[in-house]
């Protein structure tokens, strides 16, 4: 359920508020609907950077749970093959705040277009 993914993103934003994490993360800020699965996979990969950088058990657990929920939601859509989409490394690097903002935006796109 994508709303549960949103809920975990809210938890992560709450948890990182008091931390100083300097990492920049590959961020897709303008997702084309035909590339949303590819973009989501990039977001999930980059999320693990936050988990590692924070060194926080609560963030680690929440990230782990979010990835499981998101992968379950993606697999329920069946095996979607997308072509012509950007590789993660081609995306713009943004700070954590902007990354999470764009992450919420793409999850909302999955909800809105389901």
């Amino acid at each position: 359920n994508w709303v549960n993914v949103i809920s975990d993103l809210k938890k992560i934003e709450d948890l990182i508020q008091s931390m100083h994490i300097d990492a920049t993360l590959y961020t897709e800020s303008d997702v084309h609907p035909s590339c949303k699965v590819t973009a989501m996979k990039c977001f999930l990969l980059e999320l693990q950077v936050i988990s590692l950088e924070s060194g926080d058990a609560s963030i680690h657990d929440t990230v782990e749970n979010l990835i499981i929920l998101a992968n379950n939601s993606l697999s329920s859509n069946g095996n979607v093959t997308e072509s012509g989409c950007k590789e993660c490394e081609e995306l713009e690097e943004k700070n954590i705040k902007e990354f999470l903002q764009s992450f919420v935006h793409i999850v909302q796109m999955f909800i809105n277009t389901s």
Epitope: V3, K10, E13, S29, Q101, S102, H105, I111, N112, T113
Partner: antibody, heavy 119, light 108 residues
């Protein structure tokens, strides 16, 4: 600075169709944002009507869904609202608004236009 | 329920602090945003996300969230803060946007 401007008839007859257009300037309707219509009956609170994304995706308030159509015209940088089978209860100030990226918010609003349903 | 509940009215003495609340189950998953609306004017976004202020919004406005409740705090209320305040979020399906019923703030 993004600006939104609603236009359309200020008076609609009962059982008729309310039609409004929102012209977007200072920004592109083909941005990553969703675009919404919100209304406010006189002396009452705000009610979300529906939203559209420039690729044509729409979502509507379940209580209005059977009567609402929102469309987008990218060539004119505008989006439109149609509300059918109107009654006096649809009399309200109608606002168009741009949704922010990420968490729910409306970061830019039109000034609003009063639509009265009366014969 | 996907409703957002606000107290209809609140008051604050000039220069004092007031907190306006918004309750709803959906706020466990989503942050709320807050709008100020003065008579005859369109709403203005004052707080969004965890606690973000758009440019031009005074820093006396702040937002917070706990459980199923979102709060807007005005620290050192000014006469010009007298207005209606609305919260906004998504419903529990995530698909639909919803508003609270609004709180009319009077500055005494």
């Amino acid at each position: 600075q993004v600006q939104l401007q609603e236009s359309g008839p200020g008076l609609v007859k009962p059982s008729g169709t309310l039609s409004l257009t929102c012209a977007v300037s200072g920004g592109s309707i083909s941005s990553s944002n969703w675009w919404s219509w919100v209304r406010q009956p006189p002396g009452k609170g705000l009610e979300w009507i529906g939203e559209i994304y420039h690729y044509g995706y729409t979502n509507y308030n379940p209580s209005l869904k059977s009567r609402v159509t929102i469309s987008v015209d990218k060539s004119k940088n505008q989006f439109s609202l149609k509300l059918s089978s109107v009654t006096a209860a649809d009399t309200a100030v109608y606002y168009c608004a741009r949704e922010g990226i990420g968490w729910p918010s409306f970061d830019y609003w039109g000034q609003g236009t009063l639509v009265t349903v009366s014969s | 329920s996907s409703e957002l509940t606000q107290d209809p009215a609140a008051s604050v003495a000039l220069g004092q602090t007031v907190r306006i609340t918004c309750q709803g189950d959906t706020l466990r998953s989503y942050y709320a945003s807050w709008y100020q609306q003065k008579p005859g004017q369109a709403p203005i976004l004052v707080i969004y996300g965890k606690n973000n202020r758009p440019s031009g919004i005074p820093d006396r406005f702040s937002g917070s969230s706990s459980g199923n409740t979102a709060s807007l705090t005005i620290t050192g209320a000014q006469a010009e803060d007298e207005a209606d305040y609305y919260c906004n979020s998504r419903d529990e399906s995530g698909k639909n946007l919803v508003f609270g019923g609004g709180t009319k703030l009077t500055v005494l």
